[in-house]
C-alpha cells in the first residue's frame, strides 16, 4: 500500500535486523515525470540494489559489526540519466542481535592496592569487549567477582563495578586488609553480555592477582589554634607520615599568602611558626607533600586544615570621626534620623563582636536634654521629644558609647536641623535633545550633563538633588551621578549599549530630594526632563539564547547519545562555530555547526551531577568574536551501586555469657539516588551456616535487626555476613560483614587485661 512500502522520493530511515536473509523489499519509490528511473549511491556494499522502477531491496544478510549504518543516496533521473530529483539520504540502520561473545582483553591481570585505600576507589580495571551494540543488552557487559581467594570469615574485601569493570575495596576491605596477615589475593572475574540478566547470555572469565601494600599516608584531623598565642614558637600542631622512610616533606600554600606561618620538618611534624591573627585570616588550608629524592611526588598531597579561634582583642570602631545626620524642622516624633553603624573586627555573630549603643551626652541640652534616643542593638537614632527649631538650635552633637563585652568606644554624631523641604527641583531644560553613540562606548563614560536647581536651604537634604531615570531604560544601561556641590548630574554608561535591542531610547529623568517634601507640595513637570539616545551598530560577539543551558540524561546512556544542545545567534547574522571548554572528564563533544552535544564516554552520576562545562560560540569569519555560556548536564541515576553498611560497625559486643537472646540494629545505604520513598533494601544472612546462630529481620527500607537465636556463644569475635539487596533494576546485592564480640564485661564494658588494648569494642548491646 502507499505509505509504508511505497511512496515518493524523500529522506527515509529503515531499520533491519542483522543476520536475517532478505524476505521482503525495503521500499518502492514512485517516479514523477520527467523522472523515469532511479540511481542508488553511497555505502551499498553491493548488498543494496535499486531497480529501474524504484524498487529498493537488499540481496544478502547484513552484519552490524561490519557496518552499523548504511548511508545511501537515491536520486530520480530523467531518461537522459540527469538527476531531476534528489539525491535524498536513505539511512539503513542495522539492528543488533547477540551474535558476539564478550572477551577479556587479558587472560590475567595484576595489580596492587594500599591498605586503607578509600572504599569504592578503583585501583585496577578489567576490560572486556563485545562487538555487539552497547546501546542494546547484546553489548551491555556485566562484570562479577566469581571467587575471592583467600576468603577470610566469608568477607568480601574486593568489589567490582558491574558496568565498568573497576575493581575497588569494599568497606571491609578498606578496614581489614593487612599485608602482614595476607599480602596477596586472587580474584576470578566473569563478564556476561545481556547485562547479565539472561540465561542466553555469553560469558568469559579472567584471573586477577592483587598485592596488598601498607598505607599510613593520611590527612590529619583539622587543627584549632587560638589567635595571639604567647607560647614560644614554633609549636607542633599536627603530623603526617609517608609509608616509607626517606621521603622529603614540604608544605604547599595553595593561597599564595604573603606570610605563611607554618613549617614541616623531615620527620613530617607540622609547626605553626608565629602567633596567628584571626582578624587577618581566620582559617588556613594548605597541603603536605611527600616527594622522592628526585623531587617527584610520591602520592596525592594531604589537605591540612587550621582554624584560628577568636579572642576578644578588638574594640568597636566608629564609621567616621563624626557622623552627620539631618533632620527637618517639622519632623515628627519617632522619625528615624539615621543609623550609626559601628564595626568590630572580632568574629561575627559571637559575643566578641556583639555591640550595644548608648547616648552618653547631648549638646546643647536645649530646649531640653533627651531629645534623641538610640536603639540599643540596632544603632538607629530617633527623635524622642518635640519638633526642633532651627533658629533656636541649628545643630546638636551627640556622644554615643559603643561597647562589646570587654571594650568601650565613644562615637560622635552631628545632627543638623534644616529647613522644611517646600521647594521642588527644577530642570534648566526640559529636553536635552538627541545624542548618537556607538554601541561599544566604554562603560563609565559620561555622555551627558544635566542640571536642575532647588531653592531650599543649600547643602541640605532639602536642596540636594538625586537624578533618576524613570523611563526609556528598563535594562538599566545608564546611571546618573550627582555632584554634591553643584547638583550637576552626569549621565554615565553603566551597562553595555545594544544597537540590536535598543537602537533608539527616549529617556526621562526625574529630579528628587533625599528629604521628603512637606505635606501639600508635590513634584511636577518642572522636575522632569528628557533626551533621546541613538545607538549605532558595532560588530558584536554572538549571544547565547540562555546564560545556562540545562539537560537531563540517564547516567548509563550509550556513547554517542545526544545529551543536549545550545543555540547562539550573532547580532550581525554571521554563522557560528561551537566548541566546549572545561570538559575536565572528557565526557562530551559538540557539533560545531549545530550546537548539539553528544556523550563520548561513559557518564557517572556518582562522580558528580550536574556536570558543568562551558560552551563557546565563535563568529565564523568577521572578527571571530566569541562568547561563553554554561551547559549543565543533570545525570539521572541508574542502579549501579551495590548496598553497603551506612557506617562503621566495628566495636559491637554482647556481655558473655549471654543471659538472654540479644539483638542489635544496623543501617544500610548505597550511593544511588533514592527519590521520594527512599531505599527499599531486603536483608538476609550471607550464608546458610549462620542460620543456627543468627536471625535477620527487616525493620524498614534501610534498617534491620540482627538477633541471636540462642545464648550459647563462645567468648570471641563472630563475623556475621549479611546479604543486602537493593531491589533495583537491575537488582544489585552487597555482602557486608558485622563483627560482633562476646566478651567479659566490667560495669557494662568489655574487660581486656592490660596489653590487649587494640580493637576494644565500644558499643554494648
Amino acid at each position: 500500500q502507499e505509505g509504508k512500502f511505497s511512496g515518493p522520493l524523500k529522506p527515509m530511515t529503515f531499520s533491519i535486523y542483522e543476520g536475517q536473509e532478505p524476505s521482503q523489499i525495503i521500499f518502492q519509490f514512485k517516479a514523477n515525470p520527467p523522472a523515469v528511473t532511479f540511481e542508488l549511491t553511497g555505502e551499498t556494499d553491493n548488498i543494496f540494489v535499486i531497480e529501474r522502477e524504484g524498487l529498493l531491496y537488499y540481496n544478502r544478510a547484513l552484519d552490524r559489526e561490519t557496518r552499523s549504518t548504511h548511508n545511501l543516496q537515491v536520486a530520480a533521473l530523467d531518461a537522459n540519466g540527469i538527476i531531476v530529483e534528489g539525491p535524498v539520504p536513505i539511512t539503513i540502520k542495522v539492528k543488533d542481535i547477540n551474535d558476539n561473545r564478550p572477551t577479556f582483553l587479558q587472560s590475567k591481570y595484576e595489580g596492587s592496592v594500599r591498605q586503607n585505600s578509600r572504599p569504592g576507589k578503583p585501583f585496577l580495571y578489567v576490560n572486556a569487549t563485545d562487538l555487539d551494540d552497547p546501546a542494546t543488552p547484546n553489548g551491555q557487559l556485566y562484570y562479577q567477582i566469581v571467587i575471592q581467594l583467600p576468603m577470610i570469615n566469608n568477607v568480601m574485601y574486593f568489589q567490582i563495578n558491574n558496568k565498568t569493570g573497576a575493581i575497588s575495596l569494599t568497606r571491609e576491605g578498606s578496614q581489614e586488609l593487612n599485608p602482614a596477615k595476607n599480602p596477596s589475593y586472587n580474584l576470578v572475574i566473569s563478564v556476561k553480555d545481556m547485562g547479565g540478566q539472561s540465561e542466553n547470555s555469553f560469558s568469559d572469565t579472567t584471573s586477577v592477582d592483587i598485592i596488598v601494600t601498607e598505607n599510613i599516608w593520611k590527612a590529619p584531623k583539622p587543627v584549632e589554634m587560638v589567635e595571639n598565642s604567647t607560647d614560644p614558637h614554633p609549636i607542633k600542631i599536627t603530623q603526617v607520615r609517608w609509608n616509607d622512610p626517606g621521603a622529603q616533606y614540604s608544605l604547599v600554600d595553595k593561597e599564595k599568602l604573603p606570610r605563611f606561618p607554618f613549617s614541616i620538618d623531615q620527620e613530617g611534624d607540622i609547626y605553626v611558626t608565629q602567633p596567628l591573627d584571626r582578624e587577618e585570616k581566620d582559617a588556613y588550608v594548605f597541603y603536605a607533600v611527600a616527594k622522592d629524592e628526585y623531587g617527584k611526588p610520591l602520592s596525592y598531597p594531604l589537605e591540612i586544615h587550621v582554624k584560628v579561634k577568636d579572642i576578644n582583642d578588638n574594640p568597636p570602631t566608629c564609621p567616621s570621626p563624626v557622623t552627620v545626620f539631618e533632620v527637618q524642622e517639622n519632623e515628627r516624633l519617632g522619625n528615624s534620623i539615621g543609623t550609626l553603624t559601628a564595626h568590630d573586627r572580632d568574629e561575627e555573630n559571637t559575643a566578641n563582636s556583639f555591640l550595644n549603643y548608648r547616648i552618653v551626652e547631648q549638646t546643647p541640652k536645649l530646649p531640653m536634654d533627651g531629645l534623641f534616643l538610640i536603639q540599643t542593638y540596632a544603632g538607629m537614632l530617633q527623635l524622642a521629644k518635640q519638633s526642633l527649631k532651627k533658629q533656636d538650635t541649628p545643630q546638636y552633637n551627640l556622644t554615643i558609647e559603643v561597647s562589646d563585652k570587654d571594650f568601650k568606644t565613644l562615637c560622635f554624631v552631628q545632627i543638623n536641623v534644616i529647613d522644611i523641604n517646600d521647594q521642588i527641583p527644577i530642570f534648566e531644560k526640559s529636553d536635552y535633545g538627541n545624542l548618537t553613540l556607538a554601541e561599544d562606548t566604554n562603560i563609565g563614560s559620561t555622555i551627558l550633563t544635566i542640571q536642575a536647581t532647588d531653592a531650599d536651604e543649600p547643602f541640605t537634604g532639602s536642596s540636594k538633588i538625586l537624578y533618576h531615570i524613570i523611563k526609556g531604560d528598563s535594562e538599566g544601561r545608564l546611571g546618573v551621578d550627582t555632584d554634591p556641590h553643584t547638583n550637576t548630574g552626569y549621565v554615565i554608561i553603566k551597562k553595555p549599549l545594544d544597537f540590536e535591542t535598543a537602537a533608539v531610547s527616549n529617556i526621562v529623568f526625574k529630579a528628587e530630594n533625599p528629604e521628603p517634601l512637606v505635606f501639600g507640595v508635590k513634584y511636577n513637570a518642572s522636575s522632569f526632563a528628557k533626551f533621546t539616545l541613538i545607538v549605532t551598530d558595532v560588530n558584536e560577539a554572538p549571544q547565547f539564547s540562555q546564560h545556562v543551558f540545562q539537560a537531563k540524561v540517564s547516567e548509563d546512556v550509550a556513547i554517542g547519545t545526544k545529551v543536549g544542545n545550545v543555540t547562539a545567534k550573532d547580532p550581525e547574522g554571521l554563522d557560528i562555530s561551537y566548541s566546549l571548554r572545561g570538559d575536565t572528564r572528557g565526557w562530551l563533544k559538540i557539533d560545531h555547526v549545530t550546537g548539539e552535544i553528544f556523550s563520548v564516554a561513559p557518564l557517572d552520576r556518582e562522580a558528580g551531577s550536574p556536570y558543568r562545562v562551558q560552551v563557546v560560540a565563535t563568529e565564523v569569519g568577521g572578527s571571530s568574536l566569541s562568547s561563553v555560556s554554561e551547559f549543565h548536564l543533570i545525570l539521572m541515576d541508574v542502579n549501579d551501586n551495590p548496598p553497603r553498611l551506612a557506617k562503621d560497625y566495628t566495636g559491637l559486643f554482647f556481655c558473655h555469657p549471654l543471659s538472654a537472646p540479644g539483638s542489635l540494629i544496623f543501617e544500610a545505604t548505597d550511593d544511588d539516588q533514592h527519590l521520594f520513598r527512599g531505599p527499599h533494601f531486603t536483608f538476609s544472612l550471607g550464608s546458610g551456616s549462620l542460620q543456627n546462630d543468627w536471625e535477620v529481620s527487616k525493620i524498614n527500607g534501610t534498617h534491620a535487626r540482627l538477633s541471636t537465636r540462642h545464648t550459647e556463644f563462645e567468648e570471641r569475635e563472630y563475623v556475621v555476613l549479611i546479604r543486602i539487596n537493593d531491589g533495583g533494576r537491575p537488582p544489585l546485592e552487597g555482602i557486608v560483614s558485622l563483627p560482633v564480640t562476646f566478651c567479659s564485661c566490667v560495669e557494662g564494658s568489655c574487660f581486656r587485661p592490660a596489653g590487649h588494648q587494640t580493637g576494644i569494642p565500644t558499643v554494648g548491646m
Epitope: 523515469v36 531518461a79 537522459n80
Partner: antibody
Framework: QVQLQQSDAELVKPGASVKISCKVS????????IHWMKQRPEQGLEWIGY????????KYNEKFKGKATLTADKSSSTAYMQLNSLTSEDSAVYFC????????????????WGQGTTLTVSS | DIVMTQSQKFMSTTVGDRVSITCKAS??????VVWYQQRPGQSPKLLIY???NRYTGVPDRFTGSGSGTDFTLTITNIQSEDLADYFC?????????FGGGTKLEIK
C-alpha cells in the same frame, strides 16, 4: 549496427508546416532518448529538445516551445519533429541524435547522429 | 541558459603539430561536457566525454581536460583528416547548449 536515417531535404513556403522523420535501427528504440538539433550555416548547434519513446516523455528548449513538436511511433521505431509557422529563420540543417545513456550506464553523450535534413523556407 | 564560449573561431595549424581548443562555460557545469568533431558536409561525431574520456575508436592523439568552467580539447600530431569543426556541449543543466565551434584549418 546502430543507424539513424533522416528524411530527405524539404523546400517549403513561409507559414507552412513540415514534419521531419528519423528512423532508427540496430538497437531497442524505447531504451534511449532521441534529441533534435538545429544547425545554420557557419553557426553552432542548438539543442531543440528530446523525446523518450518508452513513455512519450518530451522536454523542449524554451526557445523552441510552440515551434517544434516531438513525437515517436514505437511500432516503426521512428521519431518525428514537426515545425510549424515556418519563416526564413527556420532554414537550417536539422539533426536527430541518440543519447547514449540507458538504465545503469554512464554513457552521457550523443553517440549516434542522423545524416541531417536540410530545410529551406522560401517563397 | 549556460553559454559555452569557444573564443577561437578558426585555428590554423600544420600536419604533425599540436593544438589546444578551449571552451569556457558561463557557470559551473562540473564534468558534464562532451566534445564532437564535424567534418565538412557530415554529421557530428563523438570524440571525448566527461570531459577526459576518449570514445571507442577515437585515436589517442585526442585528449580532453578540465572541470567546472574551463575545458580543453588537445590534438597532438595533427593529421590532414583532422580538418573539421570542433564543438563542446554541456549537459549539466537544461537547455543543453553547444559552443559556437572552432574550425581547424591545415596549412
Amino acid at each position: 549496427q546502430v543507424q539513424l536515417q533522416q528524411s530527405d531535404a524539404e523546400l517549403v513556403k513561409p507559414g507552412a508546416s513540415v514534419k521531419i522523420s528519423c528512423k532508427v535501427s540496430g538497437y531497442t528504440f524505447t531504451d534511449h532518448t532521441i534529441h533534435w538539433m538545429k544547425q545554420r550555416p557557419e553557426q553552432g548547434l542548438e539543442w531543440i529538445g528530446y523525446i523518450y519513446p518508452r513513455d512519450a516523455i518530451t522536454k523542449y528548449n524554451e526557445k523552441f516551445k510552440g515551434k517544434a513538436t516531438l513525437t515517436a511511433d514505437k511500432s516503426s521505431s521512428t521519431a518525428y519533429m514537426q515545425l510549424n509557422s515556418l519563416t526564413s529563420e527556420d532554414s537550417a540543417v536539422y539533426f536527430c541524435a541518440r543519447w547514449g545513456y540507458y538504465f545503469g550506464s554512464t554513457s552521457y553523450y550523443f553517440d549516434f547522429w542522423g545524416q541531417g535534413t536540410t530545410l529551406t523556407v522560401s517563397s | 541558459d549556460i553559454v559555452m564560449t569557444q573564443s577561437q573561431k578558426f585555428m590554423s595549424t600544420t600536419v604533425g603539430d599540436r593544438v589546444s581548443i578551449t571552451c569556457k562555460a558561463s557557470q559551473n557545469v562540473g564534468t558534464g561536457v562532451v566534445w564532437y568533431q564535424q567534418r565538412p558536409g557530415q554529421s557530428p561525431k563523438l570524440l571525448i566525454y566527461s570531459p577526459s574520456n576518449r570514445y571507442t575508436g577515437v585515436p589517442d592523439r585526442f585528449t580532453g581536460s578540465g572541470s567546472g568552467t574551463d575545458f580543453t580539447l588537445t590534438i597532438t600530431n595533427i593529421q590532414s583528416e583532422d580538418l573539421a569543426d570542433y564543438f563542446c556541449q554541456q549537459y549539466s543543466t537544461y537547455p543543453w547548449t553547444f559552443g559556437g565551434g572552432t574550425k581547424l584549418e591545415i596549412k
